[in-house]
């Protein structure tokens, strides 16, 4: 089956959600782990990740179509210490498949705002830290 991973971000007030989405077949969920790393160009693994999600097969989902599983990492208030390069990854302990998403970055600016760049869905997101608006 075709398995892929995408990265996205959303903002709710001061909160920034970093989202790793894995698209897979229902039967491929078992043994899959999705994880998010920061500033780890070569050694991104569940052990070195900021957060990981172990997928479970959901018997409640009918059919054999493609389904998605999401890992969401929420930062309540972005600070300069969050600046860096992030990557969504996934791997299967069963099949040995390893997925690596595109690198994306958080850059905290001197004005107290931050930008998220490198996301495939929207190439450039700019967030006002104080106002909580998306421009």
């Amino acid at each position: 089956g075709c398995i892929n991973i995408t990265s996205s971000a959303s903002q709710e007030g001061t909160r920034l959600n970093l989202i790793c989405t894995v698209w897979h077949k229902k039967e491929e969920a078992e043994g899959f782990v999705v994880f998010l790393c920061k500033d780890r160009s070569g050694d991104c693994s569940p052990e070195t990740s900021l957060k990981q999600l172990r997928l479970k097969r959901d018997p409640g989902i009918d059919g054999v179509g493609e389904i998605s599983s999401q890992l969401m990492f929420t930062i309540s208030q972005v600070t300069p210490l969050h600046s860096g390069t992030y990557q969504c990854c996934a791997r299967s302990q069963k099949s040995g498949i390893r997925l690596q998403g595109h690198f994306f970055s958080i850059l905290f600016t001197e004005t107290g705002n931050y930008t998220v760049t490198g996301l495939k869905q929207r190439q450039h997101l700019e967030f006002s830290h104080n106002e909580g608006t998306l421009s």
Partner: antibody, heavy 119, light 107 residues
């Protein structure tokens, strides 16, 4: 068990230097930004400095800028605070603390290292 | 720089009493965190993001507030709650700011 252990405190004369160390264990040290917070005798808490997870970015309170240097060695799971040109007002217990990644709370604290600056 | 003003500076309460400690910010802040510190010990995170209790904190504690006014409340004071409580916020560029602390004693 997550643990932070400070060392290197002591009595030092004004104008001299001292280096504090903080040994971390029980978590993936290289994933977390770290901080130093101090507390003068019978006084409140005061943030001193912070360092990013990779060590490339450092931040200081104005009163210590140019005198204190925060650094870390991720291969040794240790962070440091080099304190130069010490003043009597730097006398305090210095705590090593871990930044919570998802929040702005300082989630884990060490037991503290006492620094006395006096002639 | 945002200044946090805690009140009262010192207070005493009897077991079972309701206690409220307030923290006022000189400008609006997004969240407030609270720490508990006992004599000779390091501070412990107690309440984070205004209202979330840290692990192991009894549910007689609660936190609330928004903008410039925040509070920590103990519903039924117990002897083990006697400590100094500090509020803390994050703001750019001053980074981490703490209140001066409120010393809570048991009557």
């Amino acid at each position: 068990e997550v643990q932070l252990v400070e060392s290197g405190g002591g009595l030092v004369q004004p104008g001299r230097s001292l280096k504090l160390s903080c040994a971390a264990s029980g978590f993936t040290f290289s994933n977390y930004a770290m901080a130093w917070v101090r507390q003068a005798p019978t006084k409140g808490l005061e943030w001193v400095a912070s360092i990013s997870s990779g060590g490339g970015d450092t931040y200081y309170r104005d009163s210590v800028k140019g005198r204190f240097t925060i650094s870390r060695d991720n291969s040794k799971n240790t962070q440091y605070l080099q304190m130069d040109s010490l003043r009597s007002e730097d006398t305090a217990t210095y705590y090593c603390a871990t930044h919570n990644y998802e929040s702005t709370v300082l989630i884990t604290w060490g037991q503290g290292a006492s620094v006395t600056v006096s002639s | 720089e945002i200044v946090l003003t805690q009140s009262p500076t010192t207070t005493a309460a009897s077991p079972g009493e309701r206690v409220t400690i307030t923290c006022r910010a000189s400008s609006s802040v997004s969240y407030m965190h609270w720490y508990q510190q006992k004599p000779g010990a390091s501070p412990k995170p107690w309440i984070y993001e205004t209202s979330k209790l840290a692990s192991g904190v009894p549910d007689r504690f609660s936190g609330s507030g928004s903008g410039t006014s925040y509070s920590l409340t103990i519903n039924n004071m117990e002897a083990e709650d006697a400590a100094t409580y500090y509020c803390q916020q994050w703001n750019y560029p001053s980074m981490y700011t703490f209140g001066a602390g409120t010393k809570l004693e048991i009557k």
